[in-house]
């Protein structure tokens, strides 16, 4: 019962976590720039992994997708990759874990198979969660370092002057969603791995049982395993088993190089 609960809870926690990772990846507010009063109106800038947005105090909002794939910083590409890998692994993990759930019966699937699937999905959730946490952390590090905004400077560009305005970007809501979601997916994965231990059938020491005809005893000869009925002379037989069934444990063992049973 505890195993089923652990597995079920692990699945639900992972499901919420992966939904959060997807939400964070799609969100535009990965980095935000505090409202600043430009000469016209208050403007709020924010960016995601896929596009950049501007919102005015009037409520007008405009977003534009990042222009080129090749022109983007390697770090941003890495964050995108980590988040996508996290989503893909998480989605596969969810699919596997659905079939692994103890409360769901699929044909004559054995507990050992379910245990293996639970472990597989658990590992996938753990890796998925780690990918999300890593991706969000890399992006957060990019914001903290502020490598492009060391000083406000002016330089000549094509068609005129370009002035870099001193500004500060802060953590957006998506970063916190990503961290929490990654953590939940990670916890869910750990729970699935714990549940796997309870699902795996313990190795049972099955005792060998020998059945014989109750009418007479069967003797095994070392030379080719020829059985005699026991009515004649039994001088060469090493062991004679009486009728009925006995387990190996019940039979006294005598050390012999011909001890086959």
């Amino acid at each position: 019962m505890a195993v089923t609960a652990c597995q079920g809870l692990g699945f639900v926690v992972s499901l919420i976590g992966i939904a959060g990772i997807i939400a964070a990846t799609c969100m535009d507010q990965w980095s935000t720039q505090d409202l600043y009063n430009n000469p016209v109106t208050a403007v709020f800038n924010y960016q995601g992994l896929w596009r950049s947005c501007v919102r005015e105090s009037s409520g007008f909002t405009e977003c534009r997708g990042y222009f080129t794939l090749l022109g983007l910083p390697a770090m941003l590409q890495a964050v995108r990759a980590l988040m996508i890998v996290g989503i893909v692994l998480g989605a596969i993990g969810l699919l596997v874990s659905i079939f692994a759930l103890k409360c769901i019966r699929i044909g004559s699937m054995e507990d050992s198979a379910k245990a293996n699937m639970t472990l597989t999905s658990g590992i996938m959730f753990i890796v998925s969660g780690l990918c999300a946490i890593a991706g969000v952390s890399v992006f957060a590090n990019m914001l903290v370092t502020n490598f492009w905004m060391s000083t406000a400077n002016m330089y000549t560009g094509m068609g005129g002057m370009v002035q870099t305005v001193q500004t500060r970007y802060t953590f957006g809501a998506a970063l916190f969603v990503g961290w929490v979601a990654g953590g939940l997916t990670l916890i869910g994965g750990v729970m699935m791995c714990i549940a796997c231990r309870g699902l795996a059938p313990e190795e049972t020491n099955y005792k060998a049982v020998s059945y014989h005809a109750s009418g007479h005893s069967v003797a095994y000869k070392p030379g080719g395993f020829k059985a005699s009925t026991g009515f004649g002379s039994n001088t060469k037989n090493k062991k004679i088993y009486d009728g009925g069934a006995r387990t190996e444990d019940e039979v006294q063992s005598y050390p012999s190089k011909h001890d086959y049973v």
Partner: nanobody, 121 residues
């Protein structure tokens, strides 16, 4: 890289009109606002008019409603309609776009090379 191309400047008689335009091209992300500044010989650069993407506008104090700024968001172009021009409107008019690149490069002000407007009888 972002390029700004200005046009429409020239010589005009007092009381006349001109329409300046400035088109931005290149890798443009979030435009915070666009507009015009001017610099007369021997004077500092001053604000003429600015407009946001949402249409909010602001004008320089000395213009007395003679100038009108407008924009075409689809074309990333800003226009300045100047009427009742006076000799003291003679200056180099600079186009300005404030673009936010966020994590890709921060907040940047782009300036055009300027277009000369001369008001002379």
């Amino acid at each position: 890289e972002v390029q700004l191309v200005e046009s429409g400047g020239g010589l005009v008689q007092p009381g006349g009109s001109l329409r300046l335009s400035c088109a931005a091209s290149g890798n443009i992300l979030s435009i915070n606002y666009a507009g015009w500044y001017r610099q007369a010989p021997g004077k500092e650069r001053e604000l003429v008019a600015l407009i946001t993407r949402g249409g909010s506008t602001t004008y320089g104090a000395s213009l007395k409603g003679r100038f009108t700024i407008s924009s075409d968001n689809a074309k990333d172009t800003v226009y300045l309609q100047m009427s009742s021009l006076q000799p003291d409107d003679t200056a180099v008019y600079y186009c300005n776009f404030r673009i936010n690149f966020g994590i890709l490069g921060g907040l940047r002000d782009y300036w055009g090379q300027g277009t000369q407007v001369t008001v002379s009888p």
